[in-house]
Protein backbone atom coordinates (compact mmCIF):
# COMPACT_ATOMS: atom_id res chain seq x y z
CA UNK A 1 0.00 0.00 0.00
CA UNK A 2 0.94 3.50 0.15
CA UNK A 3 1.43 3.75 3.31
CA UNK A 4 4.02 1.17 3.37
CA UNK A 5 5.95 2.88 0.96
CA UNK A 6 5.81 5.99 2.13
CA UNK A 7 6.58 5.17 5.57
CA UNK A 8 10.34 5.53 5.53
CA UNK A 9 10.11 8.71 3.31
CA UNK A 10 8.67 11.53 5.36
CA UNK A 11 9.66 13.91 8.20
CA UNK A 12 6.97 13.73 10.53
CA UNK A 13 5.09 16.62 12.34
CA UNK A 14 2.37 16.95 15.19
CA UNK A 15 -0.32 19.23 15.40
CA UNK A 16 0.05 22.47 17.83
CA UNK A 17 -0.84 21.37 21.25
CA UNK A 18 -4.00 22.15 22.59
CA UNK A 19 -5.07 26.14 23.02
CA UNK A 20 -1.92 26.79 20.82
CA UNK A 21 -2.85 29.37 17.80
CA UNK A 22 -1.60 28.57 14.35
CA UNK A 23 1.53 30.25 13.60
CA UNK A 24 1.70 31.76 17.03
CA UNK A 25 4.07 30.52 20.04
CA UNK A 26 2.63 27.92 22.42
CA UNK A 27 3.77 26.13 24.92
CA UNK A 28 5.82 23.17 24.11
CA UNK A 29 4.20 20.56 24.98
CA UNK A 30 5.22 16.60 22.63
CA UNK A 31 2.95 13.66 22.22
CA UNK A 32 6.06 11.83 20.71
CA UNK A 33 9.39 11.68 20.85
CA UNK A 34 10.93 13.96 18.38
CA UNK A 35 12.34 17.70 17.64
CA UNK A 36 10.38 20.39 18.87
CA UNK A 37 10.86 23.48 17.43
CA UNK A 38 11.13 26.96 19.18
CA UNK A 39 7.95 28.98 19.04
CA UNK A 40 5.23 28.88 16.66
CA UNK A 41 3.68 25.47 15.57
CA UNK A 42 6.23 23.92 13.92
CA UNK A 43 6.68 20.24 15.77
CA UNK A 44 8.77 17.59 14.27
CA UNK A 45 7.95 13.72 15.64
CA UNK A 46 7.82 10.06 14.17
CA UNK A 47 4.26 9.48 15.14
CA UNK A 48 3.23 8.50 11.63
CA UNK A 49 4.01 9.28 7.96
CA UNK A 50 3.37 12.72 5.48
CA UNK A 51 3.87 12.54 2.12
CA UNK A 52 4.39 15.76 0.78
CA UNK A 53 2.85 16.01 -2.95
CA UNK A 54 5.07 17.76 -5.29
CA UNK A 55 5.47 18.03 -9.17
CA UNK A 56 9.24 18.82 -9.32
CA UNK A 57 12.03 18.12 -7.42
CA UNK A 58 12.52 21.63 -6.62
CA UNK A 59 9.12 21.13 -4.66
CA UNK A 60 11.23 18.51 -2.01
CA UNK A 61 14.22 19.18 -0.02
CA UNK A 62 17.75 18.72 -1.12
CA UNK A 63 17.93 15.33 0.29
CA UNK A 64 14.79 14.19 -1.51
CA UNK A 65 13.14 13.85 -5.45
CA UNK A 66 9.94 14.29 -6.41
CA UNK A 67 8.38 11.02 -8.18
CA UNK A 68 5.62 8.45 -7.97
CA UNK A 69 6.05 6.16 -5.00
CA UNK A 70 5.21 2.99 -6.69
CA UNK A 71 6.52 1.72 -9.50
CA UNK A 72 4.29 2.56 -12.67
CA UNK A 73 2.39 4.79 -10.17
CA UNK A 74 -0.71 6.99 -10.86
CA UNK A 75 1.15 9.93 -12.46
CA UNK A 76 -1.03 12.17 -10.76
CA UNK A 77 0.30 10.51 -7.57
CA UNK A 78 3.83 12.20 -7.16
CA UNK A 79 5.70 12.99 -3.20
CA UNK A 80 8.97 14.17 -1.88
CA UNK A 81 11.02 10.81 -1.75
CA UNK A 82 14.20 9.72 0.47
CA UNK A 83 17.45 10.38 -1.93
CA UNK A 84 19.18 7.53 -3.29
CA UNK A 85 22.61 6.64 -2.07
CA UNK A 86 25.68 5.53 -3.56
CA UNK A 87 25.23 2.43 -5.84
CA UNK A 88 21.90 2.41 -5.65
CA UNK A 89 19.62 2.81 -8.75
CA UNK A 90 18.43 6.06 -10.49
CA UNK A 91 17.55 6.84 -13.60
CA UNK A 92 18.25 11.00 -13.09
CA UNK A 93 20.79 12.74 -11.12
CA UNK A 94 17.72 14.74 -8.63
CA UNK A 95 17.23 10.94 -7.22
CA UNK A 96 20.62 10.65 -5.98
CA UNK A 97 22.08 12.46 -2.32
CA UNK A 98 24.37 15.62 -2.65
CA UNK A 99 27.26 14.49 -3.55
CA UNK A 100 26.46 11.66 -6.28
CA UNK A 101 25.05 11.52 -9.47
CA UNK A 102 23.21 9.32 -11.85
CA UNK A 103 25.52 7.45 -14.22
CA UNK A 104 25.03 4.08 -16.23
CA UNK A 105 21.83 3.95 -13.84
CA UNK A 106 23.25 3.93 -10.53
CA UNK A 107 24.23 6.88 -8.06
CA UNK A 108 28.29 6.95 -8.22
CA UNK A 109 29.81 9.95 -6.01
CA UNK A 110 31.07 13.04 -8.34
CA UNK A 111 34.31 12.66 -6.47
CA UNK A 112 35.44 9.67 -7.93
CA UNK A 113 38.25 11.51 -9.95
CA UNK A 114 38.60 13.85 -7.45
CA UNK A 115 36.97 16.64 -8.47
CA UNK A 116 40.24 17.11 -11.02
CA UNK A 117 40.82 17.19 -14.84
CA UNK A 118 38.09 16.33 -17.19
CA UNK A 119 35.15 14.13 -16.73
CA UNK A 120 32.29 12.93 -19.25
CA UNK A 121 29.20 13.27 -18.23
CA UNK A 122 25.90 11.68 -19.47
CA UNK A 123 23.15 14.24 -18.49
CA UNK A 124 19.69 12.91 -19.77
CA UNK A 125 16.57 15.47 -19.69
CA UNK A 126 13.52 14.09 -20.17
CA UNK A 127 10.69 15.48 -21.45
CA UNK A 128 7.65 13.48 -20.87
CA UNK A 129 4.75 14.37 -18.46
CA UNK A 130 5.93 12.25 -15.87
CA UNK A 131 9.33 13.71 -14.95
CA UNK A 132 10.42 10.63 -12.84
CA UNK A 133 10.50 8.03 -15.86
CA UNK A 134 12.40 7.79 -18.92
CA UNK A 135 9.65 7.70 -20.76
CA UNK A 136 8.69 10.20 -23.54
CA UNK A 137 11.54 11.99 -25.74
CA UNK A 138 15.20 12.14 -24.04
CA UNK A 139 18.44 14.02 -25.80
CA UNK A 140 21.48 12.91 -24.57
CA UNK A 141 24.24 14.93 -24.74
CA UNK A 142 28.12 14.55 -23.78
CA UNK A 143 29.51 17.12 -21.59
CA UNK A 144 32.95 17.64 -20.83
CA UNK A 145 32.92 19.20 -17.21
CA UNK A 146 36.02 20.42 -14.72
CA UNK A 147 34.74 20.08 -11.50
CA UNK A 148 36.75 20.91 -8.40
CA UNK A 149 35.95 21.13 -4.58
CA UNK A 150 35.19 24.64 -4.91
CA UNK A 151 31.41 25.28 -5.63
CA UNK A 152 30.44 25.78 -9.17
CA UNK A 153 30.37 29.80 -10.49
CA UNK A 154 27.85 31.52 -12.78
CA UNK A 155 27.85 29.60 -15.65
CA UNK A 156 29.72 26.84 -14.40
CA UNK A 157 28.03 22.91 -15.47
CA UNK A 158 26.10 21.30 -12.35
CA UNK A 159 23.99 18.33 -11.32
CA UNK A 160 21.65 20.31 -8.60
CA UNK A 161 21.78 23.07 -6.91
CA UNK A 162 24.48 21.84 -4.35
CA UNK A 163 27.04 22.12 -6.89
CA UNK A 164 26.51 25.63 -7.11
CA UNK A 165 27.98 28.30 -4.58
CA UNK A 166 25.79 30.38 -2.52
CA UNK A 167 23.45 32.17 -4.04
CA UNK A 168 23.31 30.21 -7.41
CA UNK A 169 20.93 27.04 -8.45
CA UNK A 170 21.37 24.52 -10.71
CA UNK A 171 18.33 24.84 -13.82
CA UNK A 172 18.55 23.64 -17.38
CA UNK A 173 20.27 25.83 -19.89
CA UNK A 174 19.91 23.99 -23.57
CA UNK A 175 20.16 20.58 -23.28
CA UNK A 176 22.75 20.70 -20.12
CA UNK A 177 22.52 22.49 -16.88
CA UNK A 178 24.65 25.45 -15.19
CA UNK A 179 24.67 27.48 -12.04
CA UNK A 180 22.10 30.77 -12.37
CA UNK A 181 21.67 33.44 -10.07
CA UNK A 182 19.03 33.08 -7.49
CA UNK A 183 16.45 35.41 -8.89
CA UNK A 184 16.25 38.77 -6.59
CA UNK A 185 13.37 40.73 -5.62
CA UNK A 186 11.49 42.16 -8.93
CA UNK A 187 12.88 39.87 -10.91
CA UNK A 188 10.58 37.50 -13.48
CA UNK A 189 10.11 34.12 -12.38
CA UNK A 190 8.14 31.18 -13.35
CA UNK A 191 5.11 29.52 -11.97
CA UNK A 192 4.56 26.22 -13.35
CA UNK A 193 1.16 26.21 -13.90
CA UNK A 194 0.82 22.36 -15.87
CA UNK A 195 2.23 19.41 -13.69
CA UNK A 196 5.40 18.33 -15.82
CA UNK A 197 5.31 21.68 -17.49
CA UNK A 198 8.95 22.38 -16.04
CA UNK A 199 10.74 19.97 -18.23
CA UNK A 200 9.74 21.22 -21.40
CA UNK A 201 12.08 24.62 -20.43
CA UNK A 202 15.44 24.82 -22.31
CA UNK A 203 16.11 28.08 -20.41
CA UNK A 204 15.08 27.64 -16.63
CA UNK A 205 15.35 30.15 -14.31
CA UNK A 206 16.30 29.85 -10.63
CA UNK A 207 13.65 29.96 -7.90
CA UNK A 208 13.13 32.69 -5.77
CA UNK A 209 15.65 34.09 -3.29
CA UNK A 210 15.17 33.36 0.74
CA UNK A 211 11.71 35.73 2.05
CA UNK A 212 10.62 35.88 -1.77
CA UNK A 213 8.35 33.96 -3.72
CA UNK A 214 7.07 33.86 -7.45
CA UNK A 215 3.35 35.64 -7.48
CA UNK A 216 1.16 37.41 -10.11
CA UNK A 217 2.84 41.25 -10.86
CA UNK A 218 0.07 42.82 -8.66
CA UNK A 219 -0.47 45.17 -12.32
CA UNK A 220 -1.21 41.80 -14.21
CA UNK A 221 -3.81 40.79 -12.47
CA UNK A 222 -6.26 41.55 -14.96
CA UNK A 223 -4.27 40.80 -17.95
CA UNK A 224 -5.23 36.98 -19.19
CA UNK A 225 -3.87 33.94 -18.06
CA UNK A 226 -1.17 33.52 -20.48
CA UNK A 227 0.17 36.77 -20.49
CA UNK A 228 0.52 36.88 -16.42
CA UNK A 229 4.25 38.25 -15.26
CA UNK A 230 5.09 36.96 -12.19
CA UNK A 231 7.71 38.03 -10.71
CA UNK A 232 9.73 37.62 -7.31
CA UNK A 233 7.85 39.24 -4.57
CA UNK A 234 8.48 39.49 -0.47
CA UNK A 235 6.19 37.17 1.87
CA UNK B 1 3.72 33.28 9.60
CA UNK B 2 1.12 31.67 8.23
CA UNK B 3 -2.46 31.03 10.12
CA UNK B 4 -4.73 28.41 8.79
CA UNK B 5 -8.39 28.17 10.04
CA UNK B 6 -10.47 25.17 9.59
CA UNK B 7 -14.26 25.13 8.94
CA UNK B 8 -17.06 22.63 7.93
CA UNK B 9 -17.34 20.26 10.62
CA UNK B 10 -19.72 19.71 12.00
CA UNK B 11 -22.50 15.97 12.55
CA UNK B 12 -23.24 14.17 9.82
CA UNK B 13 -24.99 10.50 9.50
CA UNK B 14 -23.45 7.99 8.13
CA UNK B 15 -23.51 8.09 4.58
CA UNK B 16 -23.84 11.84 4.06
CA UNK B 17 -21.10 14.20 3.21
CA UNK B 18 -19.07 17.33 4.32
CA UNK B 19 -16.94 19.89 2.71
CA UNK B 20 -13.81 20.87 4.87
CA UNK B 21 -12.37 24.74 4.05
CA UNK B 22 -9.44 25.64 5.28
CA UNK B 23 -8.32 29.45 4.81
CA UNK B 24 -4.51 30.85 4.77
CA UNK B 25 -3.20 33.93 5.27
CA UNK B 26 0.14 35.33 6.17
CA UNK B 27 2.65 34.19 3.78
CA UNK B 28 2.17 33.45 0.41
CA UNK B 29 -0.20 30.67 0.15
CA UNK B 30 0.26 29.17 -3.41
CA UNK B 31 4.47 28.41 -2.17
CA UNK B 32 3.05 25.74 0.20
CA UNK B 33 1.88 22.00 -0.46
CA UNK B 34 -1.00 21.84 1.36
CA UNK B 35 -2.70 18.72 3.61
CA UNK B 36 -4.98 17.52 5.69
CA UNK B 37 -4.73 15.42 8.70
CA UNK B 38 -7.00 13.88 11.37
CA UNK B 39 -7.32 12.40 15.11
CA UNK B 40 -9.44 10.33 16.67
CA UNK B 41 -10.13 10.22 20.32
CA UNK B 42 -7.57 8.17 21.99
CA UNK B 43 -5.66 7.67 18.46
CA UNK B 44 -2.76 8.99 17.04
CA UNK B 45 -3.06 11.80 14.45
CA UNK B 46 -2.89 10.32 10.80
CA UNK B 47 -2.83 11.97 7.45
CA UNK B 48 -5.57 11.96 5.01
CA UNK B 49 -4.80 13.71 1.75
CA UNK B 50 -2.17 16.47 0.33
CA UNK B 51 -2.14 18.49 -2.73
CA UNK B 52 0.84 19.60 -4.08
CA UNK B 53 1.10 23.79 -4.39
CA UNK B 54 0.28 23.54 -8.27
CA UNK B 55 -2.60 21.31 -7.74
CA UNK B 56 -0.50 19.36 -9.96
CA UNK B 57 -0.46 16.46 -7.49
CA UNK B 58 -2.49 14.91 -5.00
CA UNK B 59 -2.37 11.84 -2.34
CA UNK B 60 -4.58 9.86 -0.46
CA UNK B 61 -4.80 7.68 2.29
CA UNK B 62 -6.06 4.74 1.37
CA UNK B 63 -9.07 4.14 4.34
CA UNK B 64 -10.35 7.46 2.00
CA UNK B 65 -9.10 6.68 -1.71
CA UNK B 66 -12.60 7.39 -3.72
CA UNK B 67 -14.72 8.96 -1.23
CA UNK B 68 -12.80 11.82 -0.25
CA UNK B 69 -11.48 14.81 -2.70
CA UNK B 70 -8.69 17.37 -2.22
CA UNK B 71 -8.90 20.86 -4.10
CA UNK B 72 -7.42 24.05 -3.72
CA UNK B 73 -7.78 27.88 -4.88
CA UNK B 74 -4.94 29.63 -4.84
CA UNK B 75 -6.57 33.12 -5.69
CA UNK B 76 -8.75 32.64 -2.42
CA UNK B 77 -6.01 30.76 -0.51
CA UNK B 78 -8.28 28.34 0.44
CA UNK B 79 -7.99 24.32 0.23
CA UNK B 80 -10.84 22.01 0.31
CA UNK B 81 -11.52 18.63 1.48
CA UNK B 82 -14.83 17.06 -0.27
CA UNK B 83 -15.79 13.64 2.27
CA UNK B 84 -18.55 11.60 0.41
CA UNK B 85 -19.70 8.66 1.77
CA UNK B 86 -18.95 9.48 5.63
CA UNK B 87 -18.31 6.38 7.91
CA UNK B 88 -18.46 6.32 11.86
CA UNK B 89 -14.64 5.99 11.29
CA UNK B 90 -13.95 8.85 9.67
CA UNK B 91 -15.42 10.99 13.29
CA UNK B 92 -12.53 13.07 14.42
CA UNK B 93 -10.71 16.47 14.52
CA UNK B 94 -9.45 17.27 11.23
CA UNK B 95 -6.23 19.19 11.03
CA UNK B 96 -5.49 21.27 8.08
CA UNK B 97 -1.43 21.81 7.83
CA UNK B 98 1.03 23.68 4.84
CA UNK B 99 4.34 22.71 4.04
CA UNK B 100 7.47 24.53 3.53
CA UNK B 101 8.60 24.43 -0.33
CA UNK B 102 11.63 21.99 0.39
CA UNK B 103 14.95 23.15 -0.85
CA UNK B 104 13.27 26.61 -2.55
CA UNK B 105 13.61 27.48 1.72
CA UNK B 106 16.68 25.95 1.95
CA UNK B 107 15.51 22.71 4.03
CA UNK B 108 16.77 18.75 3.19
CA UNK B 109 13.05 17.37 3.77
CA UNK B 110 10.07 18.90 2.87
CA UNK B 111 7.90 18.91 5.81
CA UNK B 112 4.66 20.43 7.46
CA UNK B 113 5.56 22.80 9.50
CA UNK B 114 2.10 24.95 9.59
CA UNK B 115 -0.95 23.82 11.38
CA UNK B 116 -4.55 24.58 12.09
CA UNK B 117 -6.56 24.17 15.08
CA UNK B 118 -9.28 22.04 13.44
CA UNK B 119 -12.51 20.96 13.40
CA UNK B 120 -14.25 18.70 14.87
CA UNK B 121 -16.15 15.97 12.19
CA UNK B 122 -18.66 13.69 13.76
CA UNK B 123 -20.54 10.60 11.58
CA UNK B 124 -23.13 8.89 13.39
CA UNK B 125 -24.60 5.39 12.50
Known amino acids: TLNSVLNSNAIKNLPPPLGGAAGHPGSAVSAAPGILYPGGNKYQTIDNYQPYPCAEDEECGTDEYCASPTRGGDAGVQICLACRKRRKRCMRHAMCCPGNYCKNGICVSSDQNHFRGEIEETITESFGNDHSTLDGYSRRTTLSSKMYHTKGQEGSVCLRSSDCASGLCCARHFWSKICKPVLKEGQVCTKHRRKGSHGLEIFQRCYCGEGLSCRIQKDHHQASNSSRLHTCQRH | EVQLVESGGGLVQAGGSLRLSCAASGRTFSSYAMGWFRQAPGKEREFVAAISWSGGSTVYADSVKGRFTISRDNAKNTVYLQMNSLKPEDTAVYYC??????????????????WGQGTQVTVSS
Open chain 2, 97 to 114: AAGNGGRTYGHSRARYDY
